[in-house]
């Protein structure tokens, strides 16, 4: 397991039930870098924390997932938990 | 459109407090802005959980709260100073991605005079 | 913080002028930059979001462009309306910061 997952892990853990749902909502249509497909909205709707973490690292990867997490939060007015995210991974 | 409705004019003596309204939704910003100045980003204070954040150059003198049953945001200003004498801004953050300030309300004109 | 400098202060020009109004950013900012006209006595209202992204009902004479720490805000043919203040501001992180502004004038 990597720095970057756990990190993840501990951001999406620290959301609201209803945070974590609006979460899921954005992820569908955040700008996403060219290469990279849309994890299936169908799939993601049930997840939990720790299912969506391990869905975002084999989606996306480490260092990528940890940056799309970290902009959707921004998305969401997060910023705070954004930074940690991203200080966390760059440790 | 979305209409962030404000109160215009507060007229308040040095050393005493005001506490201006915004009818809004989700994400809402205080902004402040001088005369002939730029825009000042005071706090935030989401309307659906309570969830605040402050710039900590006002973190003294601003207190963000909601009141959720009006959809309200407020915002207490206290110990105000002529510096105070200001144009305070409330904005809605309802785009989806990049976080703006999306819908503005028309501001408080808030003058500090004894 | 994260300071936001805007240059030039003003610009003085013609109707159907091209324009390009910068903004930088004091550490990478990713594309977390708005920009916001405001006329006289008015509110400001938004413009462009995610450094590109033109907001519902902007004329498409209104670009942005940049990335990081450099951003632009291009009028391609300005018009006697835009004639306001505009100002640069970023939401990448706490706290949300603007730019002092520029003013565009007529010369």
């Known amino acids: 397991m990597g720095r970057a997952r756990d990190a993840i892990l501990d951001a999406l853990e620290n959301l609201t039930a209803e945070e974590l749902k609006k979460f899921k909502l954005k992820l569908l249509s955040v700008p996403l870098r060219e290469g990279y497909g849309r994890i299936p909205r169908g799939a993601l709707l049930s997840m939990d924390a720790a299912a969506l973490t391990d869905k975002l690292v084999s989606f996306y990867l480490e260092t990528y997932g940890a940056e799309l997490t970290a902009n959707v939060l921004r998305d969401m007015g997060l910023q705070e938990m954004a930074g940690q995210l991203q200080a966390a991974t760059h440790q | 459109q979305v209409q962030l409705q404000q109160p215009g004019t507060e007229l308040v003596k040095p050393g005493a407090s005001v506490k201006l309204s915004c009818r809004a939704s989700g994400w809402t910003h205080w902004v402040k802005q001088r005369p002939g100045q730029g825009l000042e980003w005071i706090g935030n204070i989401n309307l659906s959980n309570g969830r605040t954040n402050y710039n900590?150059?006002f973190r003294a003198m601003a207190t963000l709260t909601v009141d959720k049953s009006s959809s309200t945001a407020y915002t207490q200003l206290s110990s105000l100073t002529s510096e105070d004498s200001a144009v305070y801004y409330c904005a809605n953050s309802m785009v989806p991605h990049f976080f703006p300030m999306d819908y503005w309300g028309q501001g408080t004109s808030v003058t500090v005079s004894s | 913080n994260i300071v936001m400098t805007q240059y030039p202060k003003s610009m003085s020009l013609s109707i159907g002028e091209r324009v390009t109004l910068r903004c930088k950013a004091s550490e990478n900012v990713g594309s977390y930059v708005s920009w916001y006209q405001q006329k006289p006595e008015q509110s400001p209202k938004l413009l462009i979001y995610g450094a590109s992204n033109r907001y519902t009902g902007v004329p498409d004479r209104f670009t942005g462009s940049g990335s990081a720490t450099d951003f632009i805000l291009t009028i391609t043919s300005v018009q006697a309306e835009d004639l306001a203040d505009y100002h640069c501001g970023q939401s990448y992180n706490y706290p949300l910061t603007f730019g002092a502004g520029t003013k565009l004038e007529l010369k």
């Open positions: 900590e150059k």
